[in-house]
C-alpha cells in the first residue's frame, strides 16, 4: 500500500490504477474511515457520500476537502482492458500545521543558581498533536529534571480536533553575568516539514543579590496585648528560593523549628522581650531583621512603648 | 437564525409546468448540499431533489429523474426546482431542507409550498 | 434501493409512558439515519442525527439508539406535545428513504 498525507481541509485525489480513463469501467472503490465502522462500497452513480469521496470520470476518487475523519484506508479494485483485476491501496493520514509558536510570559531575567521560569511556548491548532522543543543558543535542550525543567501540556478542541500544545521551561542557570538565548520549535514529526521556530528571547543572568529586606510584622500592631492574647509574629523576606528564617528572643535563638511565622498564643508576662528573625539564604550569610517589642499589658495603653515599631506594624532593614 | 422559505407553489394542469424557489438566510449557503423533500396529502415524506454544495452535481429518485431539476443560484443564496410534466401524483407539499449529504442531513426545513396538479 | 420499515405505523399512549418506535433498514447503513418529529400542517423537525445523537433544542427525554441494521427512537416520558408522527430516513445511499411513519395518538 502506499502511504498519502494531505493537509486538512485540501483536496486529494486517489488514482485507480488499472482502471481505463474513460466509461465504460469496471470498479469499485471501498473506504474505512473514522467516518465508517467496517468497510464503506462507494456507490459508482454517486450519493450522500460524495460530499466526502466521489467517484470521478477517469475512475478516480476525490476527497474535496479532507478532514481528521477521514483518515483511514481506501481501496480501489478494477478490471482493466485485458480484463486483469488491478487493486490500489492508500493509507491516508491529516495533517494540519499550526499558527508559529509563540513563547508567553517571558522572563525578563534570570537569578543564577536559583530555579528561574523563563517562559511558556505555545503552539495551536497542530494535528497530529506534534512536539515542541526548546533550543538554548541555538542547541537542543534536553530536560533533566534539574537545571532544566519542562512542563507540557496538550489539549485537543472537543470540535476541530486540532491541538494546542503548552511546554513551561524552568532553569537553574550556573553562574551570572551571562546572556542566553532561548528559543522554542513545533515540530508535526512529518518528513519534508521543517520546524516552526519562534522568536528567540535573550535574558541577561545576573548573580543572586541579597534580600532586598526583611521585615519584621506584628499583630497586633505595637506589639502591645492583652494576658491570654495571641501574637503573630511575620518574617517577609523578598528572596527566592526563600530562605530559612529562626528566630531571636532578648539575643538568644528561640528552639523552634524554622518558620517564617512565630505565633505566641495565650501569652504572659514570660512572653515579653525583644523579638527579632534570622534569615539565612544560601547564597549569602544570615541576615537579621530589626526587633521588636512585644509587652503584655491589662490597661491597654495607647501608642507603642519606647523601643517597639511604629505604626505600621513593622521594621524594615535599610 | 437560519431560515428556509419556498415560494411558487400553486395549481397546474398535467402536462404543465412549475418553477419552486427557497431563499435561504442566517447560514452560509455555499457550504451546504440542499435538498427538495415532498409529502402527499395524509401521506409520508418522499425525497425529491439533492444538489452539492458547488452546484455541479445533482441527484433524484427515479420517480422525477428527466422530468424535475434542481438548481441553485449561491450570489442570490436561492435553490430552485424546475418541474416539467407533471403528474397528478405529483400533488404534495414541497418542502426545501438544508443539507442532503452525509456531513449534514436535513438539520433545517421550509415551511412547505404546496403544489396541487389537476385538471 | 434500501427499504426502511417503520414500526409501529400509530400507537396510542399516555402523558408519562415511555414510546419506543423502530426503523429497520433492508442493508447496512452504518450510523446514517435520522429521526424527524412533525406535527399536521408542520415542517418535519429533526430530532436525532446519525442515529444516537440529539439534535439541539431537543428535549432529553428524546433519545436514539442502534443495533446493525435496527434503529429505535425512545421517548423516556411522553409529554402533551409528543403527540404527533415520527420518521426515520436513512442517508447513507441514495434514493433517500424514510420510513412509513409512526403516528403517536393519546389514549
Known amino acids: 500500500g502506499q502511504n498519502i498525507t494531505a493537509r486538512i481541509g485540501e483536496p486529494l485525489v486517489l488514482s485507480c490504477k488499472g482502471a481505463p480513463k474513460k466509461p465504460p469501467q469496471q470498479l469499485e472503490w471501498k473506504l474505512n474511515t473514522g467516518r465508517t465502522e467496517a468497510w464503506k462500497v462507494l456507490s459508482p452513480q454517486g450519493g450522500p457520500w460524495d460530499s466526502v469521496a466521489r467517484i470521478l470520470p477517469n475512475g478516480s476518487l476525490l476527497l474535496p476537502a479532507t478532514g481528521i475523519v477521514d483518515e483511514g484506508t481506501f481501496r480501489c479494485r478494477a478490471t482493466n482492458r485485458r480484463g486483469k483485476e488491478v487493486k490500489s491501496n492508500y493509507r491516508v493520514r491529516v495533517y494540519q500545521i499550526p499558527g508559529k509558536p509563540e513563547i508567553v510570559d517571558p522572563a525578563s531575567e534570570l537569578t543564577a543558581s536559583v530555579p528561574n521560569k523563563v517562559g511558556t511556548c505555545v503552539s495551536e491548532g497542530s494535528y497530529p498533536a506534534g512536539t515542541l522543543s526548546w533550543h538554548l543558543d541555538g542547541k537542543l535542550l534536553i530536560p533533566d529534571g534539574k537545571e532544566t525543567l519542562v512542563k507540557e501540556e496538550t489539549r485537543r478542541h472537543p470540535e476541530t480536533g486540532l491541538f494546542t500544545l503548552r511546554s513551561e521551561l524552568t532553569v537553574i542557570p550556573t553562574q551570572g553575568g551571562t546572556h542566553p538565548t532561548f528559543s522554542c520549535s513545533f515540530s508535526l514529526g512529518l518528513p519534508r516539514r521543517r520546524p516552526l521556530n519562534t522568536a528567540p528571547i535573550q535574558l541577561r543572568v545576573r548573580e543572586p543579590g541579597p534580600p532586598e529586606g526583611i521585615q519584621l510584622l506584628v499583630e497586633p500592631e505595637g506589639g502591645i496585648v492583652a494576658p491570654g492574647g495571641t501574637v503573630t509574629l511575620t518574617c517577609a523576606i523578598s528572596a527566592q528560593p526563600p530562605p530559612q528564617v529562626h528566630w531571636i528572643k532578648d539575643g538568644a535563638p528561640l528552639p523552634l523549628a524554622p518558620s517564617p511565622v512565630l505565633l505566641l498564643p495565650e501569652v504572659g508576662h514570660e512572653d515579653e522581650g525583644t523579638y527579632s528573625c534570622v534569615a539565612t539564604h544560601p547564597s549569602h550569610g544570615p541576615q537579621e531583621s530589626p526587633p521588636v517589642s512585644i509587652r503584655v499589658t491589662e490597661t491597654g495603653d495607647e501608642g507603642p512603648a519606647e523601643g517597639s515599631v511604629g505604626e505600621s506594624g513593622l521594621g524594615t532593614l535599610a | 437564525e437560519v431560515q428556509l422559505v419556498e415560494s411558487g407553489g400553486g395549481l397546474v394542469q398535467p402536462g404543465g409546468s412549475l418553477r419552486l424557489s427557497c431563499a435561504a438566510s442566517?447560514?452560509?449557503?455555499?457550504?451546504?448540499?440542499m435538498t427538495w423533500v415532498r409529502q402527499a396529502p395524509g401521506k409520508g415524506l418522499e425525497w425529491v431533489a439533492s444538489?452539492?454544495?458547488?452546484?455541479?452535481?445533482?441527484y433524484y429518485p427515479d420517480s422525477v429523474k428527466d422530468r424535475f431539476t434542481i438548481s441553485r443560484d449561491n450570489a442570490k443564496n436561492s435553490l430552485y426546482l424546475q418541474m416539467n410534466s407533471l403528474r397528478a401524483e405529483d400533488t404534495a407539499v414541497y418542502y426545501c431542507?438544508?443539507?442532503?449529504?452525509?456531513?449534514?442531513?436535513?438539520?433545517?426545513w421550509g415551511q412547505g409550498t404546496l403544489v396541487t396538479v389537476s385538471s | 434501493d434500501i427499504q426502511m420499515t417503520q414500526s409501529p405505523s400509530s400507537l396510542s399512549a399516555s402523558v408519562g409512558d415511555r414510546v419506543t418506535i423502530t426503523c429497520r433498514a433492508s442493508?447496512?447503513?452504518?450510523?446514517?439515519v435520522n429521526w424527524f418529529q412533525q406535527k399536521p400542517g408542520k415542517a418535519p423537525r429533526r430530532l436525532i442525527y446519525?442515529?444516537?445523537n440529539l439534535a439541539d433544542g431537543v428535549p432529553s427525554r428524546f433519545s436514539g439508539s442502534r443495533s446493525g441494521t435496527d434503529f429505535t427512537l425512545t421517548i423516556s416520558s411522553l409529554q402533551p406535545e409528543d403527540f404527533a408522527t415520527y420518521y426515520c430516513?436513512?442517508?447513507?445511499?441514495?434514493?433517500?428513504?424514510f420510513g412509513g411513519g409512526t403516528k403517536v395518538e393519546i389514549k
Open positions: 431542507a438544508r443539507g442532503g449529504d452525509i456531513k449534514v442531513s436535513l438539520d433545517r
Open positions: 442566517g447560514f452560509t449557503f455555499n457550504n451546504y448540499w
Open positions: 444538489i452539492d454544495n458547488s452546484g455541479d452535481n445533482t
Open positions: 442493508q447496512d447503513v452504518g450510523i446514517y
Open positions: 446519525r442515529a444516537t
Open positions: 430516513l436513512e442517508f447513507d445511499e441514495h434514493p433517500l428513504t
